[in-house]
């Protein structure tokens, strides 16, 4: 059965300066390959977080993604600014050179409210 990427919230609202959690769970870790978060779609989409590296200053993983059975790939964005508004997608890749996108969540739209 093919892996499914579940983003339960269609949208979240957050006040500027606060933090928000974007939820994402997978139904399987197979086939092996990375999980990444993007804002937007298509060629211009922006990488927000990758579970393969740890250099994303305002974004952290919520659960311990180093657990070998971990299926929770939710992220927390801190100190949200108006520029963070947009639709965020949790995306599962299959390993390769380059990695191949095989499944995306339905997206979670982030609305940023004035403080």
């Amino acid at each position: 059965t093919e892996v499914k990427v579940i983003q339960p919230e269609k949208s979240v609202s957050v006040a500027a300066g606060d933090s928000t959690v974007l939820n994402c769970t997978l139904t399987s870790l197979l086939p092996v390959g990375p999980i990444r978060w993007y804002r937007g779609v298509g060629q211009s989409r922006q990488l927000i977080y990758s579970f393969t590296t740890e250099h994303f200053p305002r974004v952290t993983n919520v659960s311990d993604a180093t657990k070998r059975s971990n299926l929770d790939f939710s992220i927390r964005i801190s100190n949200v600014t108006p520029e963070d508004a947009g639709t965020y997608y949790c995306v599962k890749f299959q390993r390769g050179s380059p990695d191949t996108e095989i499944q995306s969540g339905g997206g979670t739209e982030v609305y940023v409210l004035a403080k």
Partner: antibody, heavy 118, light 107 residues
Framework: DVQLVESGGAVVRPGESLRLSCAAS????????MSWVRQAPGKGLEWLAG????????YYIDSVKGRFTISRDNSENSLYLQMNSLTAEDTAVYYC???????????WGLGTLVTVSS | ALTQPASVSANPGETVKITCSGG??????YGWYQQKSPGSAPVTVI????KRPSDIPSRFSGSASGSAATLTITGVRVEDEAVYYC???????????FGAGTTLTVL
Amino acid sequence: DVQLVESGGAVVRPGESLRLSCAASGFTFSSYAMSWVRQAPGKGLEWLAGISAGGSDTYYIDSVKGRFTISRDNSENSLYLQMNSLTAEDTAVYYCARETWNHLFDYWGLGTLVTVSS
Amino acid sequence: ALTQPASVSANPGETVKITCSGGDWYSTYYGWYQQKSPGSAPVTVIHSDDKRPSDIPSRFSGSASGSAATLTITGVRVEDEAVYYCAGYDGRTYINTFGAGTTLTVL
């Protein structure tokens, strides 16, 4: 610079216990899963056990399950391997290794020698 | 179990390929580790199939397809003489496995 330094290796008798330590520095220890790997004299590398970054999940090869326990203290940047009921087959150099995101290894310690002999 | 040749040899400047078979493309990631003498610390030359650590020379490369992984050393040098171990992480079983090691001799 990432540094992993093992200690605690010794000569022990069959049936005895030993606790190995691995002191980590140069990276955010609490963000990484860790593993223990050993090499018996004249043999190849053998993975023994792994532990998640938070320490809640542990994994073992069948041959050491129930005898060896991997643990960590993130406040001390330390990894441990408690070894019980040791036999001559456990004689080896024991290495700690930092795991990559997909549970392979990127950095290794220099190793500590455990000799089990009567 | 992961299978790799017991030994390979090459002249300086030649290209060496060491294969590692027995994994499953669907569930196994591969890495390669260099050990220059028994009991000395292994050095990671490739992880995640094809990722080379920043301090490893570019003559080392890795690839994976089907049920096998390959370590390629392009323009081998005398200092590359070592035992090379492949390792796999299996996402089904959560277990790591090493091959028996390949002794590279540079003639």
